[in-house]
């Protein structure tokens, strides 16, 4: 956020700028919780996203028969393992072709046991309020996918018939994660020291971080003909004075005319 | 990367000889793996043997067992194929194939490296 300066004043403007806002010769330049001429403002809604994407990894391990281990398989620069990665991704995206969340494998790590697989399954979806039952789901096919794979490509006679074969028994999912969006945690990290007065409220399934000072929300605070202003102390309303009236109060609700303030020191007098 | 190039292919009546070969290049290890496929015309590609360079294992095809002899040269660099008592259905284009792995499956999607083939024709 910026505010732009011209004239004489802006030299002195240069070096008031306010809660880490820098001069960029012509205006301060606000980090992302203040604005105003000299950022010393508080936004009242900070942008938490969501994400376009959610993503999770799924730590698996399965023992491939069809390959006799060698010592190069543990070095991940040599031809050896390059080409088994090659082979190994593109049965797995066979594997793997009718889930949509699917993005691809990763081995991690190649061990003798026949050759054991250590690898994850990256997996990522649309964010939507769903996402976690869409995610759990996909793991789930990941899971039913990998197991009919590695029961029915086997070696028969020593020998296998397809791109790569398994052993039944070496198929195992270690541990999933899930990448976590909570639009609350990252409301008050970004609200800084003013985490405690930021809430989240949702419009059209879309979380809103907002200050009471934020109009429109169900949290907002009325401060009438006042200004809403964010403190270290929370949410406080300015009052202020028309031609006619002074207004004060919490919330700027008690006005006061002038003219029977005026009149009654006139009476006094 | 990888090259692979055959020759040796020909016209040959039934029970005739005829000796393939495939010279490789670009491996960065001394053991691999290395095929014969073959393709006749309206058929998928098919194995008809491999082997192991290290000499760790030899495979044949039910179908040419007896009469044909893979073999390797570290030396050369060169892989063999050694065909006796020819037949008709025997009649197909001819492909080398390697891996860096070493490999145990007859499927040719899981081997990375091929030939240009040779045509073997067994005609009388």
């Known amino acids: 956020r910026t505010t732009t300066c011209f004239g004489d004043g802006c030299q002195n403007t240069a070096s008031r700028c306010k809660n880490g806002g820098t001069w960029d010769g012509l205006k301060c330049q606000c980090p992302n919780l203040y604005y105003g001429e000299l950022c010393e403002e508080v936004v009242s809604s900070i942008d938490i996203g969501p994400p376009e994407t959610i993503s999770a990894q799924m730590e698996l391990t399965v023992t491939v028969t069809s390959v006799k281990f060698t010592e190069e398989l543990k070095n991940h620069s040599s031809q050896e393992f390059q080409e088994f990665k090659q082979t190994f991704t593109e049965q797995m995206n066979i594997v793997y072709s009718g889930i949509p969340e699917y993005v691809g494998v990763n081995i991690t790590k190649l061990r003798l046991g026949s050759v054991v697989v250590e690898h994850d399954v990256l997996l990522r979806t649309k964010y939507t309020p769903e996402y976690k039952t869409v995610l759990d789901n996909a793991t789930e096919v990941v899971k039913e996918k990998i197991t009919k794979v590695t029961t029915q490509q086997i070696m028969i006679n020593d020998i296998c018939s397809d791109m790569m074969c398994f052993n039944t028994t070496g198929t195992q999912v270690q541990n999933i994660t899930v990448t976590q969006y909570d639009p609350e945690e990252d409301c008050r990290k970004m609200a800084k020291e003013y985490g405690d007065y930021f809430v989240v409220e949702y419009r059209d399934q879309k979380p809103y971080c907002i200050s009471p000072c934020e109009p429109g929300f169900s949290v907002s605070k009325n401060c009438n003909l006042g200004k809403c202003q964010m403190s270290l102390s929370g949410p406080q309303c300015l009052c202020v004075t028309t031609e006619t009236h002074w207004y004060s109060g919490e919330t700027c609700n008690q006005g006061t005319q002038k003219s029977l303030v005026y009149g009654h020191h006139h009476h006094h007098h | 990367d990888v090259q692979l190039v055959e020759s040796g292919g020909g016209v040959v009546q039934p029970g005739g000889s005829l000796r393939l070969s495939c010279a490789a290049s670009?491996?960065?290890?001394?053991?691999?793996?290395m095929a014969w496929f073959r393709q006749a015309p309206g058929k998928e590609r098919e194995v008809v043997a491999f082997i192991w360079t290290d000499g760790g294992r030899t495979y044949y095809a039910d179908s040419v067992k007896g009469r044909f002899t893979i073999s390797h040269d570290n030396s050369k660099n060169t892989l063999y194929l050694q065909m006796n008592s020819l037949r008709a259905e025997d009649t197909a284009m001819y492909y080398c194939?390697?891996?860096?792995?070493?490999?145990?499956?007859?499927?040719?999607?899981?081997?990375?490296?091929w030939g240009q083939g040779t045509q073997v024709t067994v005609s009388s």
């Open positions: 670009g491996y960065t290890s001394n053991r691999y793996s």
């Open positions: 194939a390697a891996s860096s792995l070493l490999l145990q499956t007859i499927n040719p999607r899981a081997w990375p490296y």
